[in-house]
Every structure is written in C-alpha cells, then in structure tokens.
C-alpha cells in the first residue's frame, strides 16, 4: 500500500467565488474516497466535479475533486480522503 499525497489549491472563479481543488496523487491501490465536506456533512454530489482515477506513470494513481464555494466561507469546507483504511481531512488554504 502506498498512501496518497493530498494537496488542496484554490483559484479565482466568478466574482465572489473560488474553485477549490483537492488532488490525491502517488497512491496504490487505486480505490480511494475523495470528497468535499461542507459544515461537517457531505457536500451534495451535483456540486462536485471528480476527475478519473488515472495511472501517474510510477505504478501509482492520481485523482482530484473540485467544487465552487463563496469566498470567505473557506473555513466551512474540508477535503476528506480515505484510502486503504486510513483517512485524513484537508482544509482550504488561506
């Protein structure tokens, strides 16, 4: 088992909004849960976009999930990752 490296980034979207992207890379096996939580509960699936789980060329995999949020509400969002029985949560950077 190779645990993922998880990285959260933000980018400007429309006025007053930002897109936050959570990337998991260099993990094996390929089964992974990567999702955004808002206010501690599940963010609805129709407000998230997922990338495919793809090989990254080193025998490991990578994927991502993104969502658009209001600027100023970043604290209320965390990216949740679960892989091979381990889990972690990742805040949006300031």
């Amino acid at each position: 088992t190779v645990p993922p490296m998880v990285n959260v980034t933000r980018s400007e979207a429309s006025e007053g909004n930002i897109t936050v992207t959570c990337r998991a890379s260099s993990f094996y096996p390929r089964n992974i849960i990567l999702t955004w939580r808002q206010d501690g509960v599940s963010l609805s699936h129709d407000t998230q976009q997922w990338g495919d789980v793809l090989p990254d060329g080193n025998g490991t995999y990578q994927t991502w999930v993104a969502t658009r949020i209001c600027r100023g509400a970043e604290q209320r969002f965390t990216c949740y990752m679960e892989h091979s029985g381990n889990h972690s949560t990742h805040p949006v950077p300031s």
């Epitope: 939580r37 501690g40 029985g85």
Partner: antibody, heavy 119, light 107 residues
Framework: DVQLQESGPGLVKPSQSLSLTCTVT?????????WNWIRQFPRNKLEWMGY???????NYNPSLKSRISITRDTSKNQFFLQLISVTTEDTATYYC????????????WGQGTLVTVSA | DIQMTQSPASLSASVGETVTITCRAS??????LAWYQQKQGKSPQLLVY???MLADGVPSRFSASGSGTQYSLKINSLQPEDFGSYYC?????????FGAGTKVEIK
C-alpha cells in the same frame, strides 16, 4: 482544551420560553467550529437541535425551526438557546457541544442541564 | 431525514465477553457515522468517528466497522467500565440524527 458549561432555569411553565446559556472556555467561538445544542429526553433519545457557527450562521433541525433560536455573545464567549411555546414534551437534559468542520461528530459535550416543563 | 435504528435495545453480558451493537441507517450514509458511550448521569463521550476511527484515548478493545447502511461497534473482552449506553449518530446530511441507544448491563 475546549470546555463547555450549560446554565439556565431548571423549571419552565408550559407555553413559556426556555432560555439556556453555554459558556465556552479554552477557545474563542469566533475562531472556528459549529457550536451546537443537543437534548436528551427522559427516555434517553438524543435530538440534535441546531448550531451557530464561528461566523454567526445558524442551522436548525427542521422539526424545531418555528420555535428555536440560537444566538451568541462574542464578548462573553457564550452562545444561547431559546425555545418558545414549550410543552411538557420539551422536558429534557440540554447539552451544548461543538464540532470541527472535518466532520459533524461531537468530541466534547457540556455536563448537561435538566429542564423540566411543568405547570 | 435519515433514521438510525440500533439493535439490540439492551443486552446483558459478563466481564470478559465480546459484544456487538449494530446500527442501521435508512439510507446510505457512506461511513459518515459516529459512536458514543454514555454512563448513567454523565454526558456522552465520543468513541468512534468516520465509522471506523477510534477517538483519542479509546481502548483498542473497541472496534467499529460497516459501510452503506449497516454499521457495528464491537467490544472485545468487556470491562466493568464499559457498561452503560451506546449511541450511533450519522453526519451524512442535516438534520443530524442519533440511534435510540443500546444499554449494556452486567449479567
């Protein structure tokens, strides 16, 4: 460590309002987290009532929405529960708690305060 | 709302026994589940979050598992301090709801 302490009257008359205070020490309620009220009925059923978060946003259980208000006093690091038009069915032990945004579970609770609704 | 159904409502067990408590959600909660222990006259204490993760300070005789709508809490080699009531709680969506509880009593 975050510590929470509930206070308020132990007896309320039917049709009146129930008002409780949660005093938080060890952490500023404006820094982060969702600050919650949960109650436990005499037969031990637990009910999440709602929260006020670090920025003052509230979220209530729809079953209580017409009767509940959660507010705060940031200068005293306190948050409050008001429940109007109470009946004997609102007799319960009321707890305050908080959760972090990595997941809505409750790591620490206050000791609880029993409120009896009776004429 | 998601309803949480716990079973059994109560059980009697002896020190050293293994007990299992189950919790069924009315919909898929995708591991968004916590377990609490409550002793008589005390506040609930967090045992497990994210369905399987033990909270800080929880003894390793406790374990939890499950997925989808079915979850369980197992206590290996029950100790005197383990007697009390246990509750599950989902956090998939609002409103957050709890199971009705399982009371673990001394046989």
């Amino acid at each position: 460590d975050v510590q929470l302490q509930e206070s308020g009257p132990g007896l309320v008359k039917p049709s009146q309002s129930l008002s409780l205070t949660c005093t938080v020490t060890g952490y500023s309620i404006t820094s982060d987290y969702a600050w919650n009220w949960i109650r436990q009925f005499p037969r031990n059923k637990l009910e999440w009532m709602g929260y006020i978060n670090y920025s003052g946003t509230t979220n209530y259980n729809p079953s209580l929405k017409s009767r509940i208000s959660i507010t705060r006093d940031t200068s005293k690091n306190q948050f409050f529960l008001q429940l109007i038009s109470v009946t004997t069915e609102d007799t319960a032990t009321y707890y305050c708690s908080y959760y972090r945004y990595d997941g809505a579970w409750f790591p620490y609770w206050g000791q609880g305060t029993l409120v009896t609704v009776s004429a | 709302d998601i309803q949480m159904t716990q079973s059994p409502a109560s059980l009697s067990a002896s020190v050293g026994e293994t007990v299992t408590i189950t919790c069924r959600a009315s919909g898929n909660i995708h591991n968004y589940l916590a377990w609490y222990q409550q002793k008589q006259g005390k506040s609930p204490q967090l045992l497990v979050y994210n369905a399987i993760m033990l909270a800080d300070g929880v003894p390793s005789r406790f374990s939890a598992s499950g997925s989808g709508t079915q979850y369980s809490l197992k206590i290996n080699s029950l100790q005197p301090e383990d007697f009390g009531s246990y509750y599950c709680q989902h956090f998939w969506s609002f409103p957050l709801t709890f199971g009705a509880g399982t009371k673990v009593e001394i046989k």
